[in-house]
Interface confidence: medium
């Protein structure tokens, strides 16, 4: 039975040209995290595997940095980066947990962070 929950940074906004940290946290389970995938729609951004280490997809290596922790830092943001991001936690023995973050990249300087929320 999957008892865990994923807490994410929720809906967030950031300025064009700036950077943002995408963060998820798995709680309420003793399952072992074997891998975390970060995806944007159908594109794989990065992987953090417990044994094999971090890997950033080739097309994102110049502006995506691993961390902090199991999070992901997006740099040199463009308006095209606006959209849904998913953290996918592969765990044993529970299975897969998925968290969703919506990022809006703004032209102006009125970007502000949204509240945290949970996905069961």
């Amino acid at each position: 039975m999957m008892t865990g929950t994923i807490e994410t940074t929720g809906n967030i906004s950031a300025e064009k040209g700036g950077s943002i940290i995408l963060q998820c946290h798995l709680s309420s389970t003793t399952a072992q995290v074997t891998q975390v995938n970060w995806e944007q729609q159908d594109q794989l951004l990065a992987i953090c595997n417990a044994d094999l280490g971090w890997h950033i997809s080739p097309s994102f290596k110049d502006r995506v940095a691993p961390g902090p922790g199991l999070g992901l830092t997006l740099q040199s943001l463009t308006v095209n980066d606006t959209g849904e991001y998913f953290c996918i936690y592969h765990t044993y023995p529970d299975g897969t947990y998925t968290g969703r973050i919506f990022l809006e990249v703004l032209e102006s300087s009125v970007a502000e962070h949204g509240a945290r929320f949970q996905i069961p």
């Epitope: 794989l44 992987i47 417990a50 044994d51 094999l52 280490g53 971090w54 890997h55 080739p58 592969h90």
Partner: antibody, heavy 119, light 106 residues
């Protein structure tokens, strides 16, 4: 210079076990995952599994669970693979290969250990 | 499990000829690499992450592709290029290889 030196050829009887070694030099063994790959004569490459010498964590191809056992010895910078209950299907060359986390690929390979199962 | 199918299985090319080897996946593949293996030797990394040439690989080699279709191309076949080429992918938690393409000199 990174080198993976594998143990010599083995001729074993059906039903027996064999343990081969892969000695790493030129880098710290605990910093890189070690993979093992099987190649039957005249055939392609088949992934067996890997061991993380840092914490002895292993991951196996389902097909090789119960057949292969991966271990490592940090003090001698050596990775081992034991194959059990051998049959003619296990006759092959077995390679160890270092995992490069930057590319998520195998960057250095041992010269291979040939295993022949015959009565 | 992601299954990689290489084609052709065997091909022959004249010196100076352009050669293309393909690797198709039954579902979207991650981190596709190519290895070269010559008879009696261990495989060598040849192309990393679809298109990055490994150290020492001649510039006449190139790699491309995305999703389920990938290819290795030699712009001008060289004598030392005769070998077997394998594609490989990693998709949690399995590593799989293609069956290989044997490239010979015509």
């Amino acid at each position: 210079e990174v080198q993976l030196q594998q143990s010599g050829p083995e001729l074993v009887k059906p039903g027996a076990s064999v343990k081969m070694s892969c000695k790493a030099s030129g880098y710290t063994i605990t910093s890189y995952v070690m993979h093992w790959v099987k190649q039957k004569p005249g055939q392609g490459l088949e992934w067996i599994g890997y061991i993380n010498p840092y914490n002895d964590g292993t991951k196996y191809n389902e097909k090789f669970k119960g057949k292969a056992t991966l271990t490592s010895d940090k003090s001698s910078s050596t990775a081992y693979m034991e194959l059990s209950s051998l049959t003619s299907e296990d006759s092959a060359v077995y390679y160890c290969a270092r995992w490069n986390p930057y590319y998520y690929a195998m960057d250095y390979w041992g010269q291979g250990t040939s295993v022949t199962v015959s009565s | 499990e992601v299954v990689l199918t290489q084609s052709p299985a065997i091909t022959a090319a004249s010196l100076g000829q352009k050669v293309t080897i393909t690797c198709s996946a039954n579902s979207s593949a991650r981190y596709v690499h190519w290895y070269q293996q010559k008879s009696g030797t261990s495989p060598k990394p040849w192309i990393y992450e679809i298109s990055k040439l490994a150290s020492g690989v001649p510039a006449r080699f190139s790699g491309s592709g995305s999703g389920t279709s990938y290819s290795l191309t030699i712009s001008s076949m060289g004598a030392e290029d005769a070998a077997i080429y394998y594609c490989q992918q990693w998709n949690y938690p399995l590593i799989t290889f293609g069956a290989g393409t044997k490239l010979e000199i015509k």
